[in-house]
């Protein structure tokens, strides 16, 4: 029963985590204008992996996509790649883990196959979570590095010297969503791997029967197992998986508007 719960919980935690990774990847607020340094501007800048946005105090928000691919910093490309790899691995992991769930019967699938699938999905979730955490951490490091620089625009760059107000960027909501989501996916993956250990088919154990022959005693373990002298058994007990429940994750919304007034 504990293995069932572990597998089911691992699946749900991973599902929430991957939903969070997808949300973080799509969010515009990876970096937000540092208002502590410059709270008097009537314009609020924030940037994501795919576009940058400007919110005016009048309420008008304008977002522009990064239409160049070659013009983007290698670090940003790396973060995008890590997040996409994390999503892809997580999605495949979810697909595999659905079929690995003990409560779902697909034909005459062996328990050993389910155990292998659980382990595979667990590893995928772990790698997915690590990719997300790495991606978010690389971006955070990029922000910290650039914090004290007065940059015209972190991504699009500006040809020539253009006089602008120093706009410094700090951690946006997406970074925290990404870190938490990556952590959840990682935890879910670990839980799936733990569940896998208890999912392997149990070897049939019989109690040793003692036969007294002339002059000496030998203990036999019927069923093709190797005999051992004495009556001590060293076979490990296996928990039997008896099914579990699965829950659906709800879609989360992220309030991400910055209101000036």
């Amino acid at each position: 029963m504990a293995v069932t719960a572990c597998q089911g919980l691992g699946f749900v935690v991973s599902l929430i985590g991957i939903a969070g990774i997808i949300a973080a990847t799509c969010m515009d607020q990876w970096s937000t204008q540092d208002l502590y340094n410059n709270p008097v501007t009537a314009v609020f800048n924030y940037q994501g992996l795919w576009r940058s946005c400007v919110r005016e105090s009048s309420g008008f928000t304008e977002c522009r996509g990064y239409f160049t691919l070659l013009g983007l910093p290698a670090m940003l490309q790396a973060v995008r790649a890590l997040m996409i790899v994390g999503i892809v691995l997580g999605a495949i992991g979810l697909l595999v883990s659905i079929f690995a769930l003990k409560c779902i019967r697909i034909g005459s699938m062996e328990d050993s196959a389910k155990a292998n699938m659980t382990l595979t999905s667990g590893i995928m979730f772990i790698v997915s979570g690590l990719c997300a955490i790495a991606g978010v951490s690389v971006f955070a490091n990029m922000l910290v590095t650039n914090f004290w620089m007065s940059t015209a625009n972190m991504y699009t760059g500006m040809g020539g010297m253009v006089q602008t107000v120093q706009t410094r960027y700090t951690f946006g909501a997406a970074l925290f969503v990404g870190w938490v989501a990556g952590g959840l996916t990682l935890i879910g993956g670990v839980m799936m791997c733990i569940a896998c250990r208890g999912l392997a088919p149990e070897e049939t154990n019989y109690k040793a029967v003692s036969y007294h022959a002339s002059g000496h005693s030998v203990a036999y373990k019927p069923g093709g197992f190797k005999a051992s002298t004495g009556f001590g058994s060293n076979t490990k007990n296996k928990k039997i998986y008896d099914g579990g429940a699965r829950t659906e994750d709800e879609v989360q919304s992220y309030p991400s508007k910055h209101d000036y007034v």
């Epitope: 800048n45 940058s52 400007v54 009048s58 008008f60 304008e62």
Partner: antibody, heavy 117, light 113 residues
């Protein structure tokens, strides 16, 4: 879009006055209402803004304690109360609706406030 | 507060002439996030409230005649009237729309001969 301001006011020094600005022709809670002061024959001074949706305000430091901005969603009306009036407060007060680029896209006709003993 | 300096204080022109007035801000009004200049131009005719002409330094408000053109970047801005008409008699104000508190220039009074 129309912003209709209240009529001219003649007030005594030390008293207060409340100027109103009735909005019509658009969703009142979706746009900021800005207030601007213009002394006779002088330039323009920004007093502050109010978000009618949230009731949040932002003031020019110079007018903090002098002006108080409020808004009534049900009547689509913004108000500016001016307190402890002096002759320096004699001016035309405009309300305006915020627009793109933090501009003041639509203006009321203005309310003349005269502070005189 | 940001200082907005307009020049000239006044100018007298004949109808059909080209007019240029300038506005200088004490700090850059260029926002790095969208590379837009938060400078606005208004026209105020005698006895009327101001009327929006351009925002983002060069974007003409709908309904404003094409003879009005805003230009410039960072700290130096210009409003050009390509062919002045009699109805253009007014005071023209520039406004910092980037920093709080919003500040206006002293105005340029346009008079027609």
């Amino acid at each position: 879009v129309q912003l209709q301001e209240s009529g001219a006011e003649l007030v005594r020094p030390g008293t207060s006055v409340k100027v109103s600005c009735k909005a019509s022709g658009y969703a009142f809670t979706n746009y900021l209402i800005e207030w601007i002061k213009q002394r006779p024959g002088q330039g323009l001074e920004w007093i502050g803004m109010i978000n009618p949706g949230s009731g949040g305000t932002k003031y020019n430091e110079k007018f903090k304690g002098k002006a108080s901005l409020t808004a009534d969603k049900t009547s689509s009306t913004a108000y500016m109360q001016l307190s402890s009036l002096t002759s320096d407060d004699s001016a035309v007060y405009f309300c305006a609706r915020g627009g793109f680029g933090n501009s003041f896209a639509y203006w009321g006709q203005g309310t003349l406030v005269t502070v005189s003993a | 507060d940001i200082m907005m300096t307009q020049s000239p204080l006044s100018l007298t022109v004949t109808a059909g002439e080209k007019v240029t007035m300038t506005c200088k801000s004490s700090q850059s009004l260029l926002n790095s996030g969208n590379l837009k200049n938060y400078l606005t131009w208004y026209q105020q005719k005698p006895g009327q409230p101001p009327k929006l002409l351009t925002y983002w330094a060069s974007t003409r408000e709908s309904g404003v005649p094409t003879r009005f053109t805003g230009s410039g970047s960072a700290t130096d801005f210009t409003l050009t009237i390509s062919s002045v008409q009699a109805e253009d008699l007014a005071v023209y104000y520039c406004q910092n729309a980037y920093f709080y508190p919003y500040t206006f220039g002293g105005g340029t009074k346009l008079e027609i001969k």
